[in-house]
Interface confidence: low
C-alpha cells in the first residue's frame, strides 16, 4: 500500500493576514486565526512528519479584502508560490478582473500548474492563453505519480468576467476523456481537483469513471467528523464518502473557505491504485500554530501599499450619503439605492440577446449600512470611508428566490416597523408599498420587479411562482436579520465579490456620484 | 427577558485597580450586532461614557480614558468585564453595564454598583 | 469630544404642564440623539432614540424632535411619575451625555 496526505484549501478569497473567527478583520491578535504565515507552519510541519504530500487549492484564491483590490493577483501568485502548492484549480472569482486580469498576475507568475479541463479558449484567445492553464497535470509524488484534473463552475460567465472568447462546458462531460487520457498514461492515482461546489463534487465523484478523491471548492462546505473545533456546522463528516455508479467507494472533501481550515486527508492506495482507506479532517488554523516568522515579514512588507490605498481618493459624491440608522431603517436612503446600484452594476453580464442583464434586483439590510458620508470634505470618498459604512467585510452574493419567497422577506422587512431594526431593506430593481396600518405579514400592498427580459427594463408585479434572481449580501442569504426564508427557500446561491471593492468600483467608474432618493420605496394608508 | 447585573467591589483605594463584571441574560454575546457598554455616573452628576465591546470582540474606550481601561468578555459566561487602573477618589461614581443597541444608545441597564474611592 | 448642553438644568412644574427640555451639541450630530429619564437610585431608561422615535413601552405623551445640533424633548401633560432627571445623548461619534435636567413639582 502506499499512503498519499492531500492538504487542500478553497475559497481563501484573499485572507492573507489572519483574521478573527468569523474571517474578518483581525483584532484580537491572540484570538486570530488563518492567513498564509499561519498555514505555512502547519504545511511544513506536515511535509517534515510524512512522506507523500499534495498541497492543493480548489479555487477563489481571489476577490474579498483589500489585498485583492490592491495586488489584483499579484499577491496570490507571490505567496502561494512562498508556500510551494503543487496544484490550483481555476474558481470562479479567477476571472472577476477578466481574463487579462487571471494571465498577467497569476497564470504567468505561478510556479505550479493552474488547471480546468471544463474551460475551454476559442478566437484569439486560444494561442495567448495556450499552455498557462492546463486540463490537467501529472505529479510526481515520491516514487508514484498522481493525475491531477481541474474543473470549474459553468455558472462562471453569471458570476464573473470571463469574456466570451471562454467556453464553460458541462463538468463531467468535460471530465471523464481527460480521466480516460490519464488512465492511457499509466497514472491510476487520480484526484479531481475544482471549483463548482459540494452538489456537483458529489456528482463527478459518482459519475467520472477513473476519479479516486474529489477536492473540492465554491460553496463553502464544512466537513468534519467527531466534535467541530470553532464555529462552523458540519455538512456532513470528512471524508464524505460517494459510492460511484461502478461500486467504488469516493471520498469528496471540502475544507470551508477564507483559510481558517487546512484540509487534511490521508488516502492509502493498492499498487492498482484503488483507495484502500481514507481519513482525515481539517485542521482548524487557530493562534496555537505560530506565523512563520519569514512569510510574516514578507506580509507586514507588502502591507505598506495597502495602508496608503485605503486614504486615497476613489470619486467624488456632490450630495450627501445618508448611511444613517433614522433614514436606512425607516425608509429609502440615498446609500441604500446607491450600494444597490453598485450591486447591479457589479453583476453586469450581457449573456444572451433575450436578456438584457441576468439579473435586475437587489435587496439590502438597512442596519448592514453603518455611517453616513459627508459630501462637504471636498466630496472625497475614500476606501476608509466605505469600510466605516460597510465595515462588517461581507459578499454581495446572487441567489434564486422564488417570488412567494420575496414577498416574505418584504414583509419580514417592515413586521416590527419603527424599532430601528436592522431587517428594514433598501433595493434595488424593485418598487414597494407599505400599508404599516394593516397587520404584521399582511402590509406589503405593492411589489413591483424590473424585468430581465425586455429591450427596455420596466416594473412588472412581482409573480410569486416565478423564479428571480436577486442580488444581496451574503447576510441575508445566510438568514441574517431574521431573514430565515430566504436561507430555507434559496433554490440557487453563488458567493460574490467582497461588498467594499464593489461599491469602491463603482464609484471609481462612475467618478461623481449624486444618489438621490426616488420613490423605490413607499408607504400608503388604505387604499393606494 | 434581557437582565443585566453589575458585580464588583465597593471600596477601592487610591492608585488600585478596579475590576468590574457584568453578568446578563436574555441575549447573547455572539448574535451579530450585540454589545455590551459600560456607563459611569458620580453622584448627584451626569453619566459619563467609558468602555464597549461589540460582539466580534471589537472595542471602543472613552478617548479620555483610553489608558486606563480594558474591556472584555466571556461569551460562554455571558460576562464582560471592565478594569480600570490607577483609581483616584474623582473616579467614585455608580458604574452601570448596558446593552448596546445596534447603534449607540443603550436600552437595557443594569441596576448599577456604586464604587467609592477612598483610602 | 461632542458636548452636550442641556437646558434648564432644573426646572419646576405641575401635573398637567406641558413641558420642554433642549439640548444644544457642539457639533452636527445629525439625528444621532437619544433621552434618557432617571429616577433616583435608578438606572437611567432610554425614552427616545434616533432624536423623535419613542422606545416600545414609552407613553405616547413624551417626544423628541430636532437635527443637526438643537434637540428638543417635549412631555405634553406631566403626570406624578414622570418627575425625575431626564438626560440627552448623543452617539454620533463616542457616545457623550448633556448634564441632565432636575424635573421637580412645583
Known amino acids: 500500500a502506499w499512503e498519499l496526505t492531500i492538504l487542500h484549501t478553497n475559497d481563501v478569497h484573499s485572507r492573507l493576514e489572519q483574521t478573527s473567527e468569523d474571517s474578518s478583520k483581525c483584532v484580537n491578535a491572540s484570538r486570530c486565526m488563518g492567513g498564509v504565515a499561519r498555514l505555512f507552519t502547519k504545511v511544513q510541519q506536515i511535509r517534515r512528519a510524512e512522506p507523500n504530500v499534495l498541497l492543493l487549492d480548489a479555487g477563489d484564491q481571489y476577490q474579498g479584502t483589500i489585498w485583492f483590490t490592491v495586488y489584483k493577483g499579484a499577491e496570490v501568485a507571490h505567496f502561494m508560490n512562498a508556500l510551494r502548492y503543487d496544484a490550483m484549480a481555476l474558481g470562479n472569482h479567477e476571472f472577476d478582473n477578466g481574463v487579462e486580469g487571471l494571465i498577467e498576475p497569476l497564470l504567468k507568475e505561478a510556479k505550479f500548474p493552474i488547471l480546468s479541463a471544463n474551460i475551454k479558449a476559442k478566437g484569439p484567445l486560444a494561442s495567448q492563453i495556450s499552455g498557462l492553464y492546463l486540463p490537467y497535470k501529472v505529479l510526481p509524488v515520491g516514487d508514484e505519480v498522481v493525475g491531477i484534473v481541474g474543473y470549474t463552475s459553468k455558472e462562471t460567465p453569471f458570476l464573473s468576467n470571463p469574456g466570451t472568447n471562454l467556453v464553460f462546458e458541462d463538468e463531467i462531460t468535460a471530465l471523464q476523456p481527460e480521466v480516460d487520457k490519464l488512465k492511457t498514461l499509466n497514472v491510476n492515482k487520480i484526484i479531481a481537483l475544482g471549483h463548482s461546489g459540494f452538489e456537483m463534487d458529489k456528482l463527478i465523484a459518482q459519475k467520472v469513471r477513473g476519479v479516486d478523491v474529489v477536492v473540492g471548492g465554491h460553496s463553502n462546505t464544512f466537513l468534519y467528523t467527531g466534535n467541530p473545533p470553532s464555529k462552523e456546522v458540519p455538512a456532513g463528516k470528512y471524508p464524505f464518502i460517494v459510492t460511484s455508479d461502478d461500486g467504488r467507494k469516493v471520498p469528496v472533501v471540502q475544507a470551508y473557505a477564507f483559510g481558517k481550515y487546512l484540509g487534511y486527508l490521508k488516502i492509502e492506495f493498492d499498487e492498482r491504485g484503488n483507495v484502500i482507506s481514507s481519513h482525515g479532517n481539517p485542521i482548524l488554523l487557530n493562534s496555537s500554530i505560530p506565523e512563520d516568522p519569514s512569510i510574516k515579514a514578507d506580509i507586514n512588507k507588502w502591507r505598506i501599499k495597502l495602508d496608503n490605498y485605503s486614504t486615497q481618493e476613489l470619486g467624488k459624491t456632490i450630495v450627501y450619503l445618508d448611511g444613517s440608522s433614522q433614514s436606512c431603517r425607516f425608509r429609502e436612503c440615498n446609500m441604500g439605492n446607491l450600494i444597490c446600484d453598485a450591486m447591479i452594476n457589479n453583476n453586469l453580464r450581457h449573456t444572451d440577446e433575450m436578456f438584457w442583464n441576468h439579473v435586475s434586483m437587489c435587496i439590502l439590510n438597512g442596519g448592514g449600512i453603518r455611517s453616513p458620508i459627508d459630501e462637504r470634505n471636498n466630496g472625497t470618498i475614500t476606501w476608509e470611508n466605505l469600510a466605516a459604512v460597510l465595515p462588517f467585510g461581507g459578499t454581495f452574493d446572487l441567489v434564486q428566490l422564488k417570488g412567494s419567497t420575496l414577498k416574505k422577506a418584504f414583509e419580514h422587512s417592515v413586521h416590527r416597523y419603527g424599532q430601528s431594526t436592522g431587517e428594514f431593506l433598501q433595493v434595488g430593481g424593485i418598487h414597494v408599498v407599505y400599508d404599516l396600518s394593516r397587520k404584521p405579514g399582511d402590509r406589503v400592498v405593492k411589489l413591483d420587479v424590473l424585468c430581465t427580459k425586455c429591450r427596455v427594463p420596466s416594473y412588472d408585479p412581482l409573480k410569486m411562482d416565478e423564479v428571480y434572481k436577486v442580488i444581496l449580501p451574503n447576510f441575508l442569504a445566510n438568514g441574517g436579520d431574521g431573514f430565515q426564508m430566504i436561507k430555507d427557500e434559496l433554490l440557487r446561491h453563488d458567493s460574490g465579490d467582497q461588498d467594499i471593492n464593489v461599491v469602491s468600483t463603482y464609484i471609481s467608474k462612475m467618478k461623481v456620484i449624486y444618489p438621490a432618493v426616488e420613490g423605490r420605496i413607499k408607504f400608503s394608508t388604505g387604499s393606494h | 427577558q434581557v437582565t443585566l447585573r453589575e458585580s464588583g467591589p465597593a471600596l477601592v483605594k487610591p492608585t488600585q485597580t478596579l475590576t468590574l463584571t457584568c453578568t446578563f441574560s436574555g441575549f447573547s454575546l455572539s448574535t451579530s450586532g450585540m454589545g455590551v457598554g459600560w456607563i459611569r455616573q458620580p453622584p448627584g452628576k451626569a453619566l459619563e461614557w467609558l468602555a464597549h465591546i461589540w460582539w466580534d470582540d471589537d472595542k471602543y474606550y472613552n478617548p479620555s480614558l483610553k489608558s486606563r481601561l480594558t474591556i472584555s468578555k466571556d461569551t460562554s459566561k455571558n460576562q464582560v468585564v471592565l478594569t480600570m487602573t490607577n483609581m483616584d477618589p474623582v473616579d467614585t461614581a455608580t458604574y452601570y453595564c448596558?446593552?448596546?443597541?445596534?447603534?449607540?444608545?443603550?436600552?437595557?441597564w443594569g441596576q448599577g454598583t456604586l464604587v467609592t474611592v477612598s483610602s | 469630544d461632542i458636548q452636550m448642553t442641556q437646558s434648564p438644568s432644573s426646572l419646576s412644574a405641575s401635573v398637567g404642564d406641558r413641558v420642554t427640555i433642549t439640548c444644544r451639541a457642539s457639533q452636527n450630530v445629525f439625528t444621532n440623539v437619544a433621552w434618557y429619564q432617571q429616577k433616583p437610585g435608578k438606572a437611567p431608561k432610554v425614552l427616545i432614540y434616533s432624536a423623535s422615535y419613542r422606545y416600545s413601552g414609552v407613553p405616547s405623551r413624551f417626544s423628541g424632535s430636532g437635527s443637526g445640533t438643537d434637540f428638543t424633548l417635549t412631555i405634553s401633560s406631566l403626570q406624578p411619575e414622570d418627575f425625575a432627571t431626564y438626560f440627552c445623548q448623543q452617539y454620533n461619534s463616542y457616545p457623550t451625555f448633556g448634564q441632565g435636567t432636575k424635573l421637580e413639582i412645583k
Open positions: 448596558a446593552r448596546r443597541e445596534r447603534w449607540a444608545w443603550f436600552a437595557y
